[in-house]
């Protein structure tokens, strides 16, 4: 079995303020078991945007049904984009652990830029 890869195809996407932004992400394998999370930024100061396992993320919807057992698609849509949302977004796979899940592999990142709302 090949080791899982995290596919984030777009290096960058551009969205007008007020619109929704879709960020694509997929896995190439169901193994290892564990959740995915989306972050804005990298390193210790990164901001959690979505956690498959828990939490409330009112502006984020998933494109696919993440609860399905064989799901490989972890694309998200973020609603009502503002300039403050600009940044690089990472789709990150975690391996199930005890007591805490362990980061396993990250996508290459997608830079979101925000255009002024069309007048």
């Amino acid at each position: 079995e090949d080791e899982l890869q995290v596919i984030q195809p777009e290096k960058s996407v551009s969205v007008a303020a007020g619109e929704s932004a879709t960020l694509r992400c997929a896995m190439t394998s169901l193994i290892p078991v564990g959740p995915i999370m989306w972050f804005r930024g990298a390193g210790a100061g990164r901001e959690l945007i979505y956690n498959q396992k828990e939490g409330h993320f009112p502006r984020v919807t998933t494109v696919s049904e993440l609860t399905k057992r064989n799901n490989l698609d972890f694309s998200i849509s973020i609603s009502n984009i503002t300039p403050a949302d600009a940044g690089t977004y990472y789709c990150v796979k975690f391996r199930k652990g005890s007591p805490d899940d362990v980061e396993f592999k990250s996508g290459a990142g997608t830079e979101l830029s925000v255009r002024a709302k069309p007048s």
């Epitope: 195809p9 551009s14 007008a16 879709t22 694509r24 997929a26 494109v63 696919s64 698609d73």
Partner: antibody
């Protein structure tokens, strides 16, 4: 008018690598944010997506074939190519190249992984010794 | 992956009749991500419908698509002689994108 044309050997030996090229004419492969895909169809059977690539080289592949597939793009020649390694008789098929018209660089495109509005005529590749 | 099941496998009809083709998904697919293709012998597939109901450029209005969730339908209101072919549905709302097994529309 944009046209796609597949080319490459029609016969490949088992365990060798299948190599095909798709030439895009009537427009530049890099003038838009399209993705370009490969799809195959074994004789008398249905369609199977192999993988897709953008003009900038971003790729994604069908997980069932991923370990054997490489897709690359050469914008200077207006071509993209498919390599499928370690072929067996099960890889005998008509191979099509096609265009995915969605602009994924626009984050408001809504996502998805591709549909195909323009196809090449296809080329039959037989795997046999 | 999402499995698309098309039915019937073969549809035997006469020119002028209405054809109704079904595509059922193993899990829900957003209607934005469902397409239909027509394929004639020895030819490449041709895009008919995308986004479940939008006709592709140059497709006659006798072809229409509908549906949502797990059930989608392609309807040909009045079959013309050139419509006898194999029809495939395809989803790309979930990775990897997948095709149905096809429905052959043949002359009765």
């Amino acid at each position: 008018q944009l046209q796609l044309q597949e080319s490459g050997p029609g016969l490949v030996k088992p365990s060798e690598t299948l190599s095909l090229t798709c030439t895009v004419s009537g427009g530049s492969i890099s003038s838009s944010s399209y993705y370009w895909g490969w799809i195959r169809q074994p004789p008398g059977k249905g369609l199977e997506w192999i993988g897709s690539i953008s003009y900038s080289g971003s790729t994604y592949y069908n997980p069932s074939l991923k370990s054997r597939v490489t897709i690359s793009v050469d914008t200077s020649k207006n071509q993209f190519s498919l390599k499928l390694s370690s072929v067996t008789a099960a890889d005998t098929a008509v191979y099509y190249c096609a265009r995915d018209p969605r602009d994924y660089s626009s984050g408001s495109s809504g996502g998805g992984w591709g549909y195909f509005d323009l196809w090449g005529r296809g080329t039959l590749v037989t795997v046999s010794s | 992956e999402i499995v698309l099941t098309q039915s019937p496998g073969t549809l035997s009809l006469s020119p002028g009749e209405r054809a109704t083709l079904s595509c059922r998904a193993s899990q829900s697919v957003s209607s934005s991500y469902l397409a239909w293709y027509q394929q004639k012998p020895g030819q490449a597939p041709r895009l008919l419908i995308y986004g479940a109901s939008s006709r592709a450029t140059g497709i006659p209005d006798r072809f229409s698509g509908s549906g949502s969730g797990t059930d989608f339908t392609l309807t040909i209101s009045r079959l013309e002689p050139e419509d006898f072919a194999v029809y495939y549905c395809q989803q790309d709302g979930n990775f990897p994108l997948t095709f149905g097994g096809g429905t052959k529309v043949e002359i009765k």
